[in-house]
Amino acid sequence: HTAAQDNCTCPTNKMTVCSPDGPGGRCQCRALGSGMAVDCSTLTSKCLLLKARMSAPKNARTLVRPSEHALVDNDGLYDPDCDPEGRFKARQCNQTSVCWCVNSVGVRRTDKGDLSLRCDELVRTHHILIDLRHRPTAGAFNHSDLDAELRRLFRERYRLHPKFVAAVHYEQPTIQIELRQNTSQKAAGDVDIGDAAYYFERDIKGESLFQGRGGLDLRVRGEPLQVERTLIYYLDEIPPKFSMKRLTA
């Protein structure tokens, strides 16, 4: 390896191809799958990450009750269409011309239709509830220590502004992290809560997206926090539109 190659990597996204051929020999990294240039000083958008993933080879406090409009990503992986900024396009279609509308985190928010389906705008997911169950420990974690550690994680590892971590709830063995970010609150350069949640989800699953960094080693006062189940609920600024058939199923 040479200095140029060694120094030309994307710390925040290992699913990239980088070469020092930008202006003045700047290191330029492009996302796999889309070939779009990415900013390696911050998180890559979930849409580009999903696209890259699909292109890769196959191998006394009460907990929050998710609202009736909360979405869970039951559809799993798909090869998304991203706009020039790397955001999800409001309408997604598969190879068989089945289409549906998605929110800003790429989760389906309508029934599936055909090519005539219209998705007028990309609806923003403004509230994300990350529901975790940790493995049994000798005793419960101290709530304020747990709160501080998770806030630190989102601030330092995912570069999410602290004001967007609305709350951390804990009732052993369930931990809930609430992320809130309205369109009006998100300034230029702010990490999106959807992207931070996706990086966290991949970290928890032991599939870190960071280049060369070790996996996530979560500890609260030195005690390992090992997650055995994760559920993520997404709340949109406009409630989703599903038929009654789905809602009663």
Epitope: T2, N7, S19, P20, G25, R26, C27
Partner: antibody, heavy 116, light 107 residues
Framework: QVQLVQSGAEVKKPGSSVKVSCKAS????????INWVRQAPGQGLEWMGQ????????HYNQKFQGRATLTADKSTNTAYMELSSLRSEDTAVYYC?????????WGQGTLVTVSS | DIQMTQSPSSLSASVGDRVTITCKAS??????LSWYQQKPGKAPKSLIY???RLVDGVPSRFSGSGSGTDFTLTISSLQPEDFATYYC?????????FGGGTKVEIK
């Protein structure tokens, strides 16, 4: 150590072409971009274009598009800049420079004089 | 194209003086700015890259600062060998553009 050795001075007639070479040593040629910069007598520096020998990707200053051609010969670790349809205002010292993140190693320069 | 406006175009200073040269970009350049020193009849030499990073082997009296559109090269205590012309370069986007240069002369 990194070295860029350029070809010697040239005197050319208006309308003709010149090809300046830049032989690189001390590093892996295909790993860094080569930029070409010129400097007219008593004037400042002017960027002409950039080539990445690793993929032959190049970018030109619009001002020289169509007149300048950048090439790289990986077998000899040599970059070339050819400028055609020369005019008197092309009289300048032409530099090649290896860049990485804005940090540059420069060749010694090649004086091209265009005169009838 | 991004315009780089360098000032002053020339200055006279004495050995030991603190010298400041500024470069203003016509738009934000994300700190992708470098500084070069050139002596008569010689090729330019890199001093600073990424706005504030000192090139190995360059004396610590040279420093770079600034962000966004406004950048500064400072020579904390001018030495006899520092009399030369200094150029800034933006490499945020193509085409790369240089400032017009600042000639530092002996007072």
């Amino acid at each position: 150590q990194v070295q860029l050795v350029q070809s010697g001075a040239e005197v050319k007639k208006p309308g003709s072409s010149v090809k300046v070479s830049c032989k690189a040593s001390g590093y892996r040629f295909t790993d860094y971009v080569i930029n070409w910069v010129r400097q007219a007598p008593g004037q400042g520096l002017e960027w002409m274009g950039q080539i990445y020998p690793g993929s032959d990707a190049f970018h030109y200053n619009q001002k020289f598009q169509g007149r300048a051609t950048l090439t790289a010969d990986k077998s000899t670790n040599t970059a070339y800049m050819e400028l055609s349809s020369l005019r008197s205002e092309d009289t300048a010292v032409y530099y090649c420079a290896r860049f990485f993140e804005g940090l540059a190693y420069w060749g010694q320069g090649t004086l091209v004089t265009v005169s009838s | 194209d991004i315009q780089m406006t360098q000032s002053p175009s020339s200055l006279s200073a004495s050995v030991g003086d603190r010298v400041t040269i500024t470069c203003k970009a016509s738009q934000g350049i994300n700190n992708y700015l470098s500084w070069y020193q050139q002596k008569p009849g010689k090729a330019p030499k890199s001093l600073i890259y990424r706005a504030n990073r000192l090139v190995d082997g360059v004396p610590s009296r040279f420093s770079g600062s600034g962000s966004g559109t406004d950048f500064t090269l400072t020579i904390s205590s001018l030495q006899p060998e520092d009399f030369a012309t200094y150029y800034c370069l933006q490499y945020d986007e193509f085409p790369l553009t240089f400032g017009g240069g600042t000639k530092v002369e002996i007072k």
